[in-house]
């Protein structure tokens, strides 16, 4: 069989994928007492079952339901931080502000963060050579469907004031095609969520523009308002200082605008 027939356009499954998932599960359940009841072998079996022996372009949200069930977790619904194209800062923030949670602070998000995986039709093999790329191959691939599924559930669980961190250095500060723009925005529940507050993170040291007036932020405001959710926006001019002030809120320099 010619080799090109099975070659996808994206990188293959992360090496030692099964061991990584299992080890992350064990570590997470040790650190989070409320998840101590989770059987990590069952979690891995459910994860594996979602994509092994299936064509990697024909994965559905239903394939992940056994995993979703095992990974069911209650996070404080009013302490949710969404992010788009600025994952590292969002994670740095929740590492300091321990009562707030990104998706990757939950078990399922933690398990899969930065990993790639896929199988092959009709074989029990994991494909370590290549996996489908969302744009060049197919959108219903194991990684994309996983993140779509967990992101939808995370957004559905949110309540009160939901925060989202956005990258002010991008040409599209709000991108309709991102997971936030295509999944999370549309799955916030208006009967539970009062306000979406965007934090636009500035990249340049001398950037004093009001990025809350950016056309893409106005587009986000329009989408959110049409869903009967209030919208507010804040510029974070100095992300380094922002993090410092989260760590030490009593610092005298933290009363001025960040």
């Amino acid at each position: 069989v010619p080799r090109w027939r099975q070659q996808w356009s994206g990188p293959g499954t992360t090496k030692r994928f099964p061991e990584t998932v299992l080890a992350r599960c064990v570590k997470y359940t040790e650190i989070h007492p409320e998840m101590r009841h989770v059987d990590c072998q069952s979690v891995w079996d459910a994860f594996k079952g979602a994509f092994i022996s299936k064509h990697p372009c024909n994965i559905t949200e239903e394939d992940y339901q056994p995993l979703m069930k095992l990974g069911t977790q209650t996070v404080p619904c009013n302490k949710i931080l969404l992010w788009s194209r600025i994952k590292d800062l969002a994670h740095q923030f929740t590492q300091v502000q321990r009562d707030m949670f990104t998706l990757e602070d939950t078990l399922l998000g933690y398990l899969a963060d930065d990993l790639t995986w896929c199988g092959e039709f009709n074989t029990s093999k994991i494909n370590y050579q290549s996996c489908p790329d969302w744009r060049k191959d197919c959108s219903n691939n194991p990684v994309s469907v996983f993140w779509k599924t967990v992101s939808r559930r995370f957004a559905e669980a949110a309540c009160d004031v939901v925060h989202v961190m956005l990258n002010g250095s991008r040409s599209k500060i709000f991108d309709k095609n991102s997971t936030f723009g295509s999944v999370e925005v549309h799955n916030l529940q208006p009967e539970k969520v009062q306000t979406l507050e965007a934090w636009v993170i500035h990249g340049g040291r001398e950037d004093s523009r009001d990025l809350c007036q950016d056309p893409t932020i106005k587009e986000l405001e329009s989408i959110i308002s049409k869903r009967n959710i209030q919208f507010s926006c804040k510029n974070i001019y100095r992300p380094d200082k922002f993090l410092q002030c989260v760590k030490n809120p009593e610092d005298s320099s933290c009363t001025s605008e960040i």
Epitope: R5, H55, C57, R135, K136, D137, C138
Partner: nanobody, 114 residues
Framework: DVQLVESGGGLVQPGGSLRLSCVAS????????MMWVRQAPGKGLEWVSR????????NYDDSVKGRFTISRDNAKNTLYLQMNSLTPEDTAVYYC???????TGQGTQVTVSS
């Protein structure tokens, strides 16, 4: 069962054009990336072109770039290959394939000769 049926081949003079079609059944066509491959007499299978599930991304072998165009109509479960400026080197049996599936159709013969 998944089935692929190719058509549109024939005898054409050098410099001529043909449009190949491939109708797929037994699967959710719009989920799968597709490709065209060909087999010239006495030679192995050669990759020609591929297209993403939505049709938004295409890729071609250097030997056909600028002459062939791959496209798809997901509403009709059909893959196409528009072949222009044909040369005798394009003579082969052309097959459509679903990336990652073993299914093969019967192919359609393209002969370029004066």
């Amino acid at each position: 069962d998944v089935q692929l049926v190719e058509s549109g081949g024939g005898l054409v003079q050098p410099g001529g054009s043909l449009r190949l079609s491939c109708v797929a059944s037994g699967l959710t066509f719009s989920s799968y990336p597709m490709m065209w491959v060909r087999q010239a007499p006495g030679k192995g299978l050669e990759w020609v072109s591929r297209i993403s599930d939505s049709g938004g991304y295409t890729n071609y072998d250097d030997s056909v770039k600028g002459r062939f165009t791959i496209s798809r109509d997901n509403a009709k479960n059909t893959l196409y290959l528009q072949m222009n400026s044909l040369t005798p080197e394009d003579t082969a049996v052309y097959y459509c394939r679903i990336l990652g599936l073993p299914t093969t159709g019967q192919g359609t013969q393209v002969t370029v000769s004066s």
